[in-house]
Interface confidence: low
């Protein structure tokens, strides 16, 4: 999906008002020194591409993020503010239902959500120079 035509300010508002809290809740009790941010993004469409990938694509050691509150709110924000996004996700959602897994918070998931927080921070500050 090409995120170029999304309403970035509306997505930012959704993050600021709710998604950020859910990410903090998920990471509660985790020390900042545990993870290094290795995923970055260069502009807002790129950030949303990376956020979508980390949030919804199962990875080795973390298959359960899509059912978390922050993921559901992220999905809703993208569906509302990115034209045509919902249609691209129908097949992916059906595939996910078939392989639904028990929700488990693993260290790998915590690391992944830590990366997500970094991506969201970057998304919210598009004018900042790349570190």
């Amino acid at each position: 999906y090409d995120f170029t035509n999304c309403d970035f300010e509306k997505i930012k508002a959704a993050y600021l008002s709710t998604i950020s809290k859910d990410l903090i809740t998920y990471m509660s009790g985790t020390k900042s020194t545990e993870f290094n941010n290795t995923v970055s993004c260069s502009n807002r469409p790129h950030c949303l591409t990376e956020i979508q990938s980390l949030t919804f694509n199962p990875t080795a050691g973390c298959a359960s993020l899509a059912k978390e509150m922050f993921a559901m709110k992220t999905k809703a924000a993208l569906a509302i503010w990115c034209p045509g996004y919902s249609e691209t996700q129908i097949n992916a959602t059906q595939a996910m239902k078939k392989r639904r897994k028990r929700k488990v918070t693993t260290n790998k998931c915590l690391e992944q959500v830590s990366q997500l927080q970094g991506l969201w921070r970057r998304f919210n500050r598009p004018l900042l120079k790349q570190q």
Epitope: L16, S28, T30, K31
Partner: nanobody, 127 residues
């Protein structure tokens, strides 16, 4: 549930002092890289960033309008961030909010645009 509760506001005469507190529950300031800050909104005006503190290294930043008068600090053992406000002026009258997961740097301290999580605490400077 993640919550921030602001307190310490009140009515004070010009030149007076107040100390605002922002207490967090549902998460721990010290546990993660959360930058924490204060912003304010005066009646009929836009919200403006006042000050923030980086949880990584304790660096602090202030809006030009409060530099030298306000001091931000944190007590991780109490999970609370404070804003000590001295030499208060009538133009400091506003509803003060704290926010977490802000971007604490010179670029952004005057641009906090987070939706308020708490109810805020009202500061009125008047003779």
């Amino acid at each position: 549930e993640v919550q921030l509760v602001e307190s310490g506001g009140g009515v004070v005469q010009p030149g007076g002092s107040l100390r605002l507190s922002c207490a967090a529950s549902g998460f721990t300031f010290a546990d993660y890289d959360y930058d924490i800050g204060w912003f304010r909104q005066a009646p009929g005006k836009e919200r403006e960033g006042v000050s923030c503190i980086s949880n990584r290294d304790g660096s602090t930043y202030y809006a030009d309008s409060v530099k030298g008068r306000f001091t931000i600090s944190r007590d991780n053992s109490k999970n609370t961030v404070y804003l000590q406000m001295n030499s208060l002026r009538p133009e400091d009258t506003a509803l003060y909010y704290c926010a977490v997961e802000i971007h604490c740097d010179d670029y952004g301290v005057e641009n906090f645009d987070f939706d308020p999580w708490g109810q805020g605490t009202l500061v009125t400077v008047s003779s």
